[in-house]
Each structure stands twice: as structure tokens, then as C-alpha cells.
């Protein structure tokens, strides 16, 4: 069993609107039809799962129903958005790729992605 | 296959000393971390020590000067040198291996680092009593 590589971002900047997008990418060193995927957050020397999915190559990932990801698949590449983020929920993103079927299963951890959210200033009062 | 089995867990009084070793194999990382995890009765499972594939090694606060992990490359085992053993340390002890040296030596010190893991063995207990 080998070890396989996952990339991703370094840094991403989170929109206005809560809104950040990365690209998990992994190398699969075999021909995977079930794949697995974990989002997990690390700050303040505690690493909690945000959200996971596990799809079927070719078809589209299903996230809960309450779960604050969603995303798209195409070859090795997973396209992630997590909405709904505040400034507290700054910190690193790290990108947990399994290969559940055929065995052997396959494991790959991301370096993770810096996920910045600056919480838009409210509108000040006008008179007008 | 990735197969570890642990061995080396038992009884033993207050103060005393145990060698947990964790044999490994069907894995062929370059760079990896090998991790000592433990599992008290209740709780959840968290880091006790850590090392990766260039030697270093990180400790749990709690286990600090008292636990020493060890990697012998060329039986691709891992070791657990437990001395002064308290009540708490009461738990069971699983190896555990990591495919990103990145998160290595945080891990002893990180609630949840089991996520930066995949491949566990079953487990031997340590209990700790007089």
C-alpha cells in the first residue's frame, strides 16, 4: 500500500458573502469507484470534521442535507465550497481523501488550505 | 494489506513499566508518521506520542518524560517505552500510522489528531493498578 498525494491550496480568501471554493486534488494510484472525501478544520490545537461525502466516480458528491459543503467532482479533482462561514471560523482546511473500493483502500491528507473570513462591516445608519 | 498488531500491554503496579511494540507492515511510505494512540474507559481516543520517518518525536504533555517512542526500520516496528506508570494511564493502546509527516509532531497535543490517521491496530490494554 503506497501513500497518495493530495494538493491543495495554500491560502483562500473567503467572499463577503461567507462563501470560500479550493480544489482538492489527489493522485490515485489506482482506478478508484468509490472515493471518499473529509473536510476537517484545524485550529486552536483541535481538528474537528466539517463535512464529508462519498461518491462513485463519475457521478456527483452528496453531502447531507444540513451540511454546510457542497461540491463537484471531475477525474482526481474535487471542487469543495463551504458557505456560511464567519470570522470565527477562520483557520486550516485540510483536505481527507480515501479510496474505499476497489481494495486495497488508499489514504491521502492534504497540507490543508488557510481559510481567511473577514465579517462584513454593517451598514451605518444614513438619515437619508 | 496495511496490518499492525500491537503487543505488550498487561497489569502492572503504580510506578511500574511496561514496552508496548507495534509490528507493521503492507505499507510502503517514504514519509509518514507512526503514532501511539490511547483509549480510556469513556473517552475518546487521543494522541500519546508521536514519530516521524526522519526520527523525531513529539509527546503528549501528560506522558512527558515518562513515555519514550522508538521505531526499529528494520522490523518495521514500533515501540512504546512506558515508565512510572499512574492509574490514569489505565487505557487501551493503539499504533497508528499517518500519510502526512505534516501534522506529525502537533499531533500528541491536538484533540481530534485521530483524523490525521487511517491505518490502526487492534489494540492491547494497559492497566494500571495496585
Known amino acids: 500500500c503506497k501513500a497518495m498525494h493530495v494538493a491543495q491550496p495554500a491560502v483562500v480568501l473567503a467572499s463577503s458573502r461567507g462563501i470560500a471554493s479550493f480544489v482538492c486534488e489527489y493522485a490515485s494510484p489506482g482506478k478508484a469507484t468509490e472515493v471518499r472525501v473529509t473536510v476537517l478544520r484545524q485550529a486552536d490545537s483541535q481538528v474537528t470534521e466539517v463535512c464529508a461525502a462519498t461518491y462513485m466516480m463519475g457521478n456527483e458528491l452528496t453531502f447531507l442535507d444540513d451540511s454546510i459543503c457542497t461540491g463537484t467532482s471531475s477525474g482526481n479533482q474535487v471542487n469543495l465550497t463551504i458557505q456560511g462561514l464567519r470570522a470565527m471560523d477562520t483557520g486550516l482546511y485540510i483536505c481527507k481523501v480515501e479510496l474505499m473500493y476497489p481494495p486495497p483502500y488508499y489514504l491521502g491528507i492534504g497540507n490543508g488550505t488557510q481559510i481567511y473570513v473577514i465579517d462584513p462591516e454593517p451598514c451605518p445608519d444614513s438619515d437619508f | 494489506e496495511v496490518q499492525l498488531v500491537e503487543s505488550g500491554g498487561g497489569l502492572v503496579q503504580p510506578g511500574g513499566s511496561l514496552r508496548l511494540s507495534c509490528a507493521a507492515s503492507?505499507?510502503?511510505?517514504?514519509?509518514?508518521?507512526l503514532g501511539w494512540f490511547r483509549q480510556a474507559p469513556g473517552k475518546g481516543r487521543e494522541a500519546v506520542s508521536t514519530?516521524?520517518?526522519?526520527?523525531?518525536?513529539s509527546y503528549a504533555d501528560s506522558v512527558k518524560g515518562r513515555f519514550t517512542i522508538s521505531r526499529d526500520n528494520a522490523k518495521n516496528t514500533l515501540y512504546l517505552q512506558m515508565n512510572s506508570l499512574r492509574p490514569e494511564d489505565t487505557a487501551v493502546y493503539y499504533c497508528?500510522?499517518?500519510?502526512?509527516?505534516?501534522?506529525?509532531?502537533?499531533?500528541?497535543?491536538?484533540?481530534?489528531?485521530?483524523?490525521?490517521?487511517?491505518?490502526w491496530g487492534q489494540g492491547t490494554l494497559v492497566t494500571v493498578s495496585s
Open positions: 503492507g505499507y510502503t511510505y517514504s514519509r509518514h508518521c
Open positions: 514519530i516521524d520517518s526522519d526520527g523525531s518525536t
Open positions: 497508528a500510522i499517518g500519510p502526512n509527516p505534516r501534522y506529525c509532531s502537533g499531533a500528541p497535543n491536538t484533540r481530534g489528531a485521530e483524523h490525521y490517521f487511517g491505518y
